[in-house]
């Protein structure tokens, strides 16, 4: 339905508060280095303009597309060339090329200072002094650091952020009330950002069909009682929402997401019995709740899949005449029966089924050729099952920190060219799979673990894409979305790698390590571990363990010393020498 003024349409649909918040998010995700005040000024100008269009849709420029309006506004930033360099060239382009150009310049790892959390009293004062600015600043800081954060979901986070301050700044012990809530929001926010980044990568690198296949599998697991036609409709709508958000069309995305939540709640009887509570909540909570809702119970007495997908005489005809529908139905039927499988495994099975039909249907006896296709699934199912079993055993044996270290060593040996901060970040996140998923019963382990690993490996892929250094990473990241994890799992030690020159400076530590939080201290130690492996990729587990134990003892000793700095200097030299000897450097 065409509207005379798109900006007026979205302003009316979303309301002023959400409109302003979403425009701020959009601008901060595009111009990640711009100061907060500059963005607020731009947002206010766009909002005033939108109001004129609401008053008169025929007013000048009100008929322009949102990309044109927003792009024109971004291109008025005076410091564009000196701050962003070649991104300024985008402004010489016409829409839609200009927006595509802005999208290509989004930076997954912007050079921004770490967000330091002020004292609770300072935060509460700032919150009370100007609540609106305080919350806008939250949106701005998150959006610029996470340029693909799912915008309507960020509104939900901001609502919870506000609620935390509203409640806790009145509490007797403000810190005890507020800090756990902020920690939870931070951790959930990072997870949400990473999950959305995978959705955008799926759409942008592998196309709409890849995303739709993922959505069919996931929604079929979640809504196994829904008919295929219903799931297909939800998939189409969900794909539109995520395509818009990943494309920077945040107003349309938020509007369409609200419409989708409304539709789901109006039709919950034919979708899922688990939606009742979600649908009683306000909009932002409702949408979040639907996105996280537990899987509905599987219908009783589902027939065998073989009848329609192996035994039927029409298998090849149905496949050839409408692959998308037939393979979509296969994926739907398989997924609704297997909430115990990861989405990526289901997609591998569907791909194997498709490949088999493509190979067999033109053969003299197609049925004989594909009759055993389900037998081909067995090794595909067993591979992640075995991997998860082994790694959960290792996790239970080592605990999270040492499990992360095992993964750090494993991945540094596989892809030693990758930067140390990226290896540390990715391996730490890979290691979190243990505490996140190994506690689950068998039936929930695989969907938890393998789909989480897909999200984490995508972080590696997007960070590596910015500055590619390893052909092996590029290959695993680009060849197949669903086979990324098996591809990385299959990598052995990179025998072509020339070990890094030893640099004592890398292993020189100072007293400041003593004041760090436990997490930051772990990161320091893990950074040293990666560097050790880069210097000595052939080092054994035992050698690395001995060096790391010595290192931990050294830090502990010097942090207890009276003259910490002298201890770090003198004992540090001894440690470096001992480590070199132990590793034969």
């Amino acid at each position: 339905d065409a509207h005379k003024s798109e900006v007026a349409h979205r302003f009316k649909d979303l309301g002023e508060e959400n409109f302003k918040a979403l425009v701020l998010i959009a601008f901060a995700q595009y111009l990640q280095q711009c100061p907060f005040e500059d963005h607020v000024k731009l947002v206010n100008e766009v909002t005033e303009f939108a109001k004129t269009c609401v008053a008169d849709e025929s007013a000048e420029n009100c008929d322009k597309s949102l990309h044109t309006l927003f792009g024109d506004k971004l291109c008025t930033v005076a410091t564009l060339r000196e701050t962003y360099g070649e991104m300024a060239d985008c402004c010489a382009k016409q829409e839609p090329e200009r927006n595509e150009c802005f999208l290509q310049h989004k930076d997954d790892n912007p050079n921004l200072p770490r967000l330091v959390r002020p004292e609770v009293d300072v935060m509460c004062t700032a919150f009370h002094d100007n609540e609106e600015t305080f919350l806008k600043k939250y949106l701005y800081e998150i959006a610029r650091r996470h340029p693909y954060f799912y915008a309507p979901e960020l509104l939900f986070f901001a609502k919870r952020y506000k609620a935390a301050f509203t409640e806790c700044c009145q509490a007797a012990d403000k810190a005890a009330c507020l800090l756990p809530k902020l920690d939870e929001l931070r951790d959930e926010g990072k997870a949400s950002s990473a999950k959305q980044r995978l959705k955008c990568a799926s759409l942008q690198k592998f196309g709409e069909r890849a995303f739709k296949a993922w959505a069919v599998a996931r929604l079929s697991q979640r809504f196994p009682k829904a008919e295929f036609a219903e799931v297909s409709k939800l998939v189409t709508d969900l794909t539109k929402v995520h395509t818009e958000c990943c494309h920077g069309d945040l107003l349309e995305c938020a509007d369409d997401r609200a419409d989708l939540a409304k539709y789901i709640c109006e039709n919950q009887d034919s979708i899922s019995s688990k939606l009742k509570e979600c649908c009683e909540k306000p909009l932002l909570e409702k949408s979040h709740c639907i996105a996280e809702v537990e899987n509905d119970e599987m219908p009783a007495d589902l027939p065998s899949l073989a009848a329609d997908f192996v035994e039927s005489k029409d298998v090849c005809k149905n496949y050839a005449e409408a692959k998308d529908v037939f393979l979509g139905m296969f994926l739907y039927e398989y997924a609704r029966r297997h909430p115990d499988y990861s989405v990526v495994l289901l997609l591998r099975l569907a791909k194997t089924y498709e490949t088999t039909l493509e190979k067999c249907c033109a053969a003299a006896d197609p049925h004989e050729c594909y009759a055993k296709v389900f037998d081909e699934f067995k090794p595909l199912v067993e591979e992640p099952q075995n991997l998860i079993k082994q790694n959960c055993e290792l996790f239970e044996q080592l605990g999270e920190y040492k499990f992360q270290n095992a993964l750090l060593v494993r991945y540094t040996k596989k892809v030693p060219q990758v930067s140390t901060p990226t290896l540390v970040e990715v391996s730490r996140n890979l290691g979190k799979v243990g505490s996140k998923c190994c506690k689950h019963p068998e039936a929930k382990r695989m969907p938890c673990a393998e789909d989480y690993l897909s999200v984490v490996l995508n972080q590696l892929c997007v960070l590596h894409e910015k500055t590619p250094v390893s052909d092996r990473v590029t290959k695993c990241c680009t060849e197949s979305l669903v086979n990324r994890r098996p591809c990385f799992s299959a990598l052995e030690v990179d025998e072509t790698y020339v070990p890094k020159e030893f640099n004592a400076e890398t292993f020189t530590f100072h007293a400041d390590i003593c004041t760090l939080s436990e997490k930051e201290r772990q990161i320091k130690k893990q950074t040293a571990l990666v560097e050790l492996v880069k210097h000595k990729p052939k080092a054994t587990k035992e050698q690395l363990k001995a060096v790391m134990d010595d290192f931990a003892a050294f830090v502990e000793k010097c942090c207890k010393a009276d003259d910490k700095e002298t201890c770090f200097a003198e004992e540090g030299k001894k440690l470096v020498a001992a480590s070199q000897a132990a590793l034969g450097l």
Partner: antibody
């Protein structure tokens, strides 16, 4: 040597019918899918349809109804009815690469036979 | 409707030149079902590349296919005298009935 050899082309009046043949030698036809593709003078290639080894046929949307593909042990046929001037073209038969059923990968082609529809 | 657009429709080049031909499909092809053919006057087409980037056996490595989804490219890295011909892309879709070819790019001697 594997060969595909078309025959049966010629001049036909508008509204008339024609049956083209594609004789296959050097391979066992019962294991392969064969396509018909045409090319009007100086124009694009146009896929007409396919017959799988099992005898199942599929046609381009525009070709359904007027064109029929069939086969016997060594020959594939293209029956063309209600011919029009715009059907004037060189008609080729071509084998689909083994291991594919619906992909446009044709590794062996005949030399083509010209069909002219004119009064 | 399926639309497969090849560009340019013709290109003049010299021996040793690098030649790039593009093929745009709407909608996207199914599962990288994209082929490239070479056709010389009075002859049948010859399959060069399948699955967007795989070289048919016997085809020289100067021919390279790339792309996915809707946008595909055939590159001849160093044009040889025998490469002057017309090149067609072919696409496969969700329905076999939609199998379509582009209208060709003629590579001529400059």
């Amino acid at each position: 040597e594997v060969q595909l050899l078309e025959s049966g082309g010629g001049l036909v009046q508008p509204g008339g019918s024609l049956r083209l043949s594609c004789a296959v030698s050097g391979i066992d036809l019962s294991n392969y899918a064969i396509n018909w593709v045409r090319q009007a003078p100086g124009k694009c290639l146009e896929w007409i349809g396919i017959i799988w080894a099992s005898g199942t046929t599929f046609y381009a949307t525009w070709a359904k109804g007027r064109f029929t593909i069939s086969r016997d042990s060594t020959t594939v046929y293209l029956q063309m009815n209600s011919l029009r001037a715009e059907d004037t073209a060189v008609y080729y038969c071509a084998r689909t690469v083994p291991g594919y059923s619906t992909a446009p990968y044709f590794d062996l082609w005949g030399q083509g036979t010209l069909v002219t529809v004119s009064s | 409707d399926i639309v497969m657009t090849q560009s340019p429709s013709s290109v003049s080049a010299s021996v040793g030149d690098r030649v790039t031909i593009t093929c745009q499909s709407s909608p996207s092809v199914w599962s990288n079902f994209l082929s490239w053919y070479q056709q010389k006057p009075g002859k049948a087409p010859k399959l060069l590349i399948y699955e967007a980037s795989k070289l048919t056996s016997g085809v020289p490595s100067r021919f390279k296919g790339s792309g996915s989804g809707t946008d595909f490219t055939l590159t001849i890295s160093s044009l040889q005298p025998e490469d002057f011909a017309t090149y067609y892309c072919g696409g496969g879709y969700s329905s076999i009935s939609d199998t379509t070819f582009g209208c060709g790019t003629k590579v001529e001697i400059k």
